[in-house]
Amino acid sequence: QLDDTWVTVFGFPQASASYILLQFAQYGNIIKHVMSNNGNWMHIQYQSKLQARKALSKDGRIFGESIMIGVKPCIDKSVME
């Protein structure tokens, strides 16, 4: 079963991963995150569904000067176990 507290954030260069993480911690208390091995997407778990929904609302937003970020519900069940 999918857990609605998880979102997937993608579209950033590897070098900007920690900066993007800082930005997404503004939307709620992150409990944990899982980084892809190439560093350009991550799964983020928030403390609540409401916080996750707030992060989802940032889909398509530009961060920094030119980083357009995608945010979608996480569908990777393996990270939720």
């Epitope: 991963a17 920690s18 900066y19 993480l21 800082l22 911690a25 208390n29 992150i30 409990i31 944990k32 995150h33 899982v34 980084m35 892809s36 091995n37």
Partner: nanobody, 120 residues
Framework: QVQLVESGGGLVQAGGSLRLSCVGT????????MAWYRQAAGKEREVVAG???????HYADSVKGRFTISRDNAKNTVYLQMNSLQPEDTGVYCC??????????????WGQGTRVTVSS
Amino acid sequence: QVQLVESGGGLVQAGGSLRLSCVGTGNISSAYTMAWYRQAAGKEREVVAGILNGGSTHYADSVKGRFTISRDNAKNTVYLQMNSLQPEDTGVYCCHVVIESTRFVYDHYWGQGTRVTVSS
């Protein structure tokens, strides 16, 4: 399990300074990122300053040139030096530390916050 305890908040007049400290009860010297956030009454949380992976720093535009974030690995502490404080800096300041627990998996730890009030 890491716990974070902030201190150093208080009431200060505009133009004054404060130094916030965030001490980790566990080892936070290997943190992936360390940051300070603030939340003013009725407003959303905002990132104030962060030490990014690799050691570079990030500051909110509103605090650049006034605030400085630093870390002391030997003391498991992250600091926020705040100078030229303005009433708009009032809020609860919260510490956030991210630590890699296993490969590609990171745990997040949050402090309870310390209140900063800047009077005009």
